[in-house]
Amino acid sequence: APRGTQAEESPFVGNPGNITGARGLTGTLRCQLQVQGEPPEVHWLRDGQILELADSTQTQVPLGEDEQDDWIVVSQLRIASLQLSDAGQYQCLVFLGHQNFVSQPGYVGLEGLPYFLEEPEDRTVAANTPFNLSCQAQGPPEPVDLLWLQDAVPLATAPGHGPQRNLHVPGLNKTSSFSCEAHNAKGVTTSRTATITVLPQQPRNLHLVSRQPTELEVAWTPGLSGIYPLTHCTLQAMLSDNEVGIQAGEPDPPEEPLTLQASVPPHQLRLGSLHPHTPYHIRVACTSSQGLSSWTHWLPVETPEGVPLGPPENISATRNGSQAFVHWQEPRAPLQGTLLGYRLAYQGQDTPEVLMDIGLRQEVTLELQGDGSVSNLTVCVAAYTAAGDGPWSLPVPLEAWRPGQAQPVHQLVKETSAPAFSWPWW
């Protein structure tokens, strides 16, 4: 570091003074020198090191007409916003000829009210749930003692006696405010006031009570909500998407869920207008005057299969001698599940109804044995799923086949081991 020499008399006629103050202070240090001839550049040192980027000014005033006469040089150093790193010993430095000269030192010190490095933050917590708050302050002067306050009431008898940097709160049953006071020899600084909002706890034990093809009944156990009664609970249902999938506890679903509000109590809700035989995910959160609890994890549920809601369509039944041809189309109405097959019912005017399971085929050829003289034959068809049979079609009379009518090649239905045809057996 540059070091002044005393071989010649110092040119400095004014030395930097002292500044002590709080963070953020704007201060100016000055030095003044009188030199003969060309005025030198004035440099500033802090703790013996040149300040390369010093915010300094320099004024040069000639004391005579000639450039070789004496000059007064004034240099000012600006400290725009005093920080701890600015504290130290300051000197002016000039190079004159082959010598350097330094002024007498001035001192910059930081001393004021405590300064917060960390303050308590607003947050939400579930009722009766432990949490921590942080507060940190520094001087100088040190030491800095902290005093926590809850709803403006000190939590200790004196600064430094209670918890310091971290305050552990075992739980709250009402929304409260917290702040901390920092005390040092200069006085007291109060932190911002953090509002800790008490929300209901996350509901527990979300489960299915009953299942119908288009509705699910669910129930849950509410969490504690402190002094604030629950106003309602909100249930969200989401079609399960195999592509995306809903992770357990994922905060937001990938698409807009169906959202329903439930009055409480009871902590139960019927979800209607659902798709049968469809996987869903559901979750629930409850609300008090203070806000919404956290959501439960997504619970996978599934609506059961239902029976088809309509009969098969476009049933056609024709008879040609000893054969009957019946064909139909899948019901237009929702199947409410996986179609397992069709049942066909056949009945004559004075004969009992006979049921057949056709499987998944949509046409059948019936081999009528005997003279086929049974009168007023009618056919009904119903679709079925694992949940049961859907509604039967209206009876379709078996019409005689007329030449010119198309006659498709049909699957014969005939049990070879069955006895010879004798109504009502096929």
């Epitope: 004014g14 202070l25 009210l113």
Partner: antibody, heavy 125, light 107 residues
């Protein structure tokens, strides 16, 4: 005699730009900090920013940061205020002022001892 | 930013009256306070710096006092040329801030 003279004010549309000059005489710009202060019609004084002409360092009020730039040319003994992205709320008389901070070895704070006559900037469509 | 609150915002006084204007800082500003006088259509003029130091050329009827957060400008005997608006300004921290002004009018 110490004197500061502003120029460059006028009418400008919102979003427009204007450059104000502050010509100093009777003292060297290098020896002090130069401040810009504005005063909206019928209102009080508002600090805009300062420059150290010797080093070129400048500080700004939050309300103008990123839009205004203060510079200086010590050879011309003149400071400048470049105003971009002007808004209606920038309408004011703009003053430049020299900082006075005494002659002791140190001081806390400062005052402004010489002010220009002011130049009116009107931002309106 | 530090707020500077001046009171009163205006006052009426007669020539020869003693006038006191106060300025309160929102936090400690030591003695880094200046006072200015401004007349309509003119630039402000420095009266007092460092809370209590009279700027050169300013009549001695003007005086300033205070430290910390409370500051006072006093005109011991109001003269006709003193009817103007007066501003306090703190420069303890950046940005420097001004009071809203006190208008001194003729009663």
């Amino acid at each position: 005699e110490v004197q500061l003279v502003e120029s460059g004010g006028g009418l400008v549309q919102p979003g427009g730009s204007l450059r104000l000059s502050c010509a100093a005489s009777g003292f060297s710009l290098s020896g002090s900090w130069i401040h810009w202060v504005r005063q909206a019609p019928g209102k009080g004084l508002e600090w805009v920013g300062w420059i150290n002409p010797y080093r070129g360092y400048a500080y700004y009020a939050d309300s103008v940061k990123g839009r205004f730039t203060i510079s200086a040319d010590t050879s011309k003994n003149t400071a400048y205020l470049q105003m971009n992205s002007l808004r209606a709320e920038d309408t004011a008389v703009y003053y430049c002022a020299r900082e006075y901070s005494g002659w002791g070895g140190s001081s806390v704070g400062y005052a402004m001892d010489y002010w220009g006559q002011g130049t009116l900037v009107t931002v309106s469509s | 930013d530090i707020q500077m609150t001046q009171s009163p915002s205006s006052l009426s006084a007669s020539v020869g009256d003693r006038v006191t204007i106060t300025c309160r800082a929102s936090q400690d500003v030591s003695t880094a306070v200046a006072w200015y006088q401004q007349k309509p259509g003119k630039a402000p003029k420095l009266l007092i710096y460092s809370a209590s130091f009279l700027y050169s050329g300013v009549p001695s009827r003007f005086s300033g006092s205070g430290s910390g957060t409370d500051f006072t400008l006093t005109i011991s005997s109001l003269q006709p040329e003193d009817f103007a608006t007066y501003y306090c300004q703190q420069s303890y921290t950046t940005p420097p801030t001004f009071g809203q002004g006190t208008k001194v009018e003729i009663k």
